[in-house]
């Protein structure tokens, strides 16, 4: 009988206790938001915000300009000096709830927790590859505002969402902030907004349209917006809100809300739930029927995915794809099954679900007893009436008006439930080559980059490390810089390749030479490595 | 050493054009904003308006803004300011200056030497 | 557009002597401010940005203070080489605007 070399179990051909060492910067305190702008030629900047602080780095993350953002009423502000002298309101510590570029102009627009949640824009002004910021703008007219109608007061203290999206010569701010009494009374941010950024940079126009939770319900029903996105013609929000406005606050779930690019109207605004499941291939005596449900959204992206991916899902390669991680509850605790689940809700279909939802509610015959919904923004309905009426007029069009989808769109947990106990608290997806990875953060402090696959019984990773010594969880938002992602953790920004931080977690040369061929990977004597880490022989073809 | 070095002076009728060249050197064009600044005879600065030659991208004060034109051509390192339908009260000196961040702040670092521009009928 | 007022118009002085030249602007506009000796016949040149901060090769005789509205530059020990005519300028906003000029001549 012919001898064979003994297998390595797969789990021995790596080692994720390997450190790597990724460029890093330390901002002087908690990451609060973090944001990247890549110009027209390779000039380009990472903007991080930190209490009372904005920082300007290059692309290298090094230090370029650092705004003294609070405290609001402070001599040293440099952002409050913009909106001419003050007092504007009561001192206090800046926390940045909003950092977005508006592309357009192109600007950085930041706003905090301070000054009724107004907003400054800084002109981006590029010098050879850094970019820095002009002056400040006050996004702010005094003469506008009033505490029950206040344009200019974007950012609520609770958290804010806000995609910026060209419409002609504006700017539109979509933003979706999370509410409470005492925020709803002090300058009314709204829940839902569509914003139009005024030419002169004084502020927003008034008269703008919005939605808000209903003074009876602030109280008891709180949204948080985790997540927005724009693609196509349309603008999502994803929230984690409870699933009745009357039954228990504490039992949520997650929705997502889209919103017209186009039409800067609230009419065609639409909720659908998301519902993502652990299905094990094996179902224990007891489990739910179709699975265990994960209902509480904890970070979401979307992308294109790969050729392979778009084959398990049914759709077209570089179709736009959103990914969810979902968990149990808010504290994200452990129950059977895995902590963290990732589901996968294809855009394309998203769309179709509403706009069938919508034909359901406004086109005859109309399911009797079947709700418009949405009561914690509007007056209870039938479909096909508007709000609050028992019957549809002749010059009313029952589409519209808000609309929550009759049905959920039902996933499952693309890794199988393989994530075990991790806790992932961030998400970013590529696609390299005809793979999508997932690039992952975690409750204490790694990076995990995997490849979004179904069939398998393993996880398929391209990296596993652990950021730095200090085990912080790695904050929710997650920007791209040319090939590399920039993840916060604690008081620090790293720079992750997307391609991963290196080859040498692969301990044998069989499992280096089947690493992905963007990866880069060589057996190198007797390591894995890449090409710039062998100074002598680097093997891809065979081992020796 | 960082040079700008400016076209020579200029005798226009009005309602003619004048175009004044700032060529640059021990820099890259492409990596600064270049500005314009106009002095008239005994008078003081008035900025005209700037580009990024890396984008072509231009401002320029409302004054100016109807007759000036502010280009680049990164292939000479060179940067052209044209001034139409001249009038008399346009007969000034006309300086290039680039402008550089230093930290959180900007100013304008470097200046040609001037252009004289003249009109008269 | 932000006007930037400069006062005096013009001074007089000997050598030896501390000199000051006040820039008031028309809004605040923080610390976005520069100071510029112009030589008749030459360029302007850059002596302080960012109101305080000092110019590469510029001595240190000549300092910048003030924020938001109200700037000053000061001379310490005028030298002859200063007898010459002292901008302010404002870069917070487009179009970006000088002073009129303090013309610092010999008495």
């Known amino acids: 009988e012919d001898w064979q070399c003994p297998r390595t179990p797969y789990a021995a051909s790596r080692d994720f206790d390997v450190k790597y060492v990724v460029p890093s910067f330390s901002a002087g305190g908690l990451v609060q938001a973090m944001v990247t702008y890549e110009g027209d030629r390779n000039e380009s900047a990472v903007f991080v915000a930190i209490r009372n602080r904005l920082h300007v780095l290059g692309p290298d993350l090094k230090s370029v300009q650092s705004l003294a953002t609070g405290p609001a009423g402070d001599p040293g502000c440099q952002t409050c000096a913009a909106c001419g002298p003050g007092p504007h309101g009561p001192p206090g510590d800046t926390d940045t709830k909003v950092l977005v570029l508006d592309p357009a102009l192109p600007a950085l627009v930041s706003c905090g927790s301070s000054l009724q949640g107004r907003c400054f824009l800084h002109d981006l002004e590029p010098q050879g590859t850094a970019v820095h910021l002009a002056a400040p703008a006050c996004l702010f007219s005094a003469h506008h505002n009033r505490p029950d109608d206040c344009p200019d007061c974007v950012a609520s203290p609770l958290g804010t969402r806000v995609t910026v999206v060209e419409q002609g010569q504006a700017s539109y701010f979509y933003v979706a902030s999370s509410l409470d009494a005492a925020v709803a009374a002090s300058f009314s941010p709204r829940s839902v907004s569509i914003r139009r950024l005024k030419a002169d940079a004084s502020g927003f126009a008034p008269g703008f349209v919005a939605l808000s939770v209903l003074p009876k319900h602030l109280v008891s029903y709180s949204i948080e917006y985790v997540h927005s996105f724009h693609t196509g013609a349309f603008v999502y929000f994803l929230t984690v809100q409870p699933a009745s406005v009357t039954d228990d606050p504490s039992a949520l779930h997650t929705r997502l809300a889209r919103l017209s690019a186009t039409e800067p109207e609230l009419g065609d605004y639409r909720e659908l739930v998301l519902d993502c499941r652990f299905a094990p291939k094996r179902r224990r005596r007891g489990a739910p029927e179709g699975g265990q449900p994960y209902p509480v959204l904890r970070v979401a992206h979307s992308a294109p995915v790969g050729a392979q991916l778009a084959t398990e899902l049914s759709i077209a390669e570089g179709q736009e794809v959103l990914f969810g991680v979902f968990v149990t509850g808010k504290d994200g605790g452990p129950g059977v099954g895995p902590n963290s689940v990732v589901c996968a809700f294809p855009i394309d279909l998203l769309d179709t679900l509403i706009d069938e939802g919508v034909e359901r509610c406004c086109e005859s015959p109309v399911h009797p007893g079947l709700r418009r919904g949405l009561d914690f923004f509007q007056s209870p309905s039938f479909c096909p009436n508007p709000p609050g009426l028992e019957a549809l007029s002749p010059n009313t069009s029952c589409r519209h008006f808000p609309l929550l989808v009759s049905s959920s769109f039902s996933r499952v947990d693309l890794f199988n439930g393989l994530l075990g106990p991790v806790q992932v608290t961030a998400l970013y997806v590529t696609r390299l080559d005809n793979v999508t990875v997932a690039h992952m953060g975690t409750m204490d402090g790694r990076i995990l980059q995997v490849e979004l696959v179904r069939s398998l019984n393993y996880l398929l990773y391209v990296s596993n490390f652990s950021l730095g010594d200090s085990g912080q969880p790695v904050q929710r938002d997650v920007s791209r810089l040319g090939d590399h992602l920039l993840f916060a953790s604690g008081d620090q920004v790293f720079q992750v390749p997307i391609q991963g931080p290196g080859c040498r977690h692969f301990l044998t040369c069989g499992r280096c030479l089947r690493a992905w061929h963007f990866m880069g990977c060589g057996w190198c004597g007797n390591m894995c490595g890449q090409q710039k880490e062998c100074p002598g022989s680097w093997q891809q073809d065979h081992c020796p | 050493e960082v040079q700008l070095v400016q076209s020579g002076a200029e005798v226009k009728k009005p309602g003619a054009t004048v175009k004044i060249s700032c060529k640059v050197s021990d820099y890259t064009l492409t990596d600064f904003y270049m500005n314009w600044v106009q002095q008239a005879p005994g008078k003081g600065l008035e900025w005209i308006g700037r580009?990024?030659?890396?984008?072509?991208?231009?401002r320029y004060n409302e004054k100016f803004r109807d007759r000036v034109t502010i280009t680049a051509d990164t292939s000479t390192d060179t940067a052209y300011m044209e001034l139409s339908s001249l009038r008399s009260e346009d007969t000034a000196v006309y300086y290039c200056a680039r402008s550089a961040y230093y930290g959180n702040y900007v100013a304008m670092d470097y200046w040609g030497q001037g252009t004289t521009v003249t009109v008269s009928s | 557009d932000i006007q930037m007022t400069q006062s005096p118009s013009s001074l007089s002085a000997s050598v030896g002597d501390r000199v000051t030249i006040t820039c008031l602007a028309s809004q605040t506009i923080g610390t976005w401010l520069a100071w510029y000796q112009q030589k008749p016949g030459k360029a302007p040149k850059l002596l302080i940005y960012a109101a305080t901060s000092l110019a590469d090769g510029v001595p240190s005789r000549f300092s910048g203070s003030g924020s938001g509205t109200d700037f000053t530059l000061t001379i310490s020990s005028l030298q002859p080489e200063d007898f010459a005519t002292y901008y302010c300028?404002?870069?917070?906003?487009?179009?970006?605007?000088f002073g009129g000029g303090t013309k610092v001549e010999i008495k």
């Open positions: 580009i990024y030659p890396g984008t072509d991208k231009t």
């Open positions: 300028q404002q870069l917070y906003n487009t179009p970006w605007t």
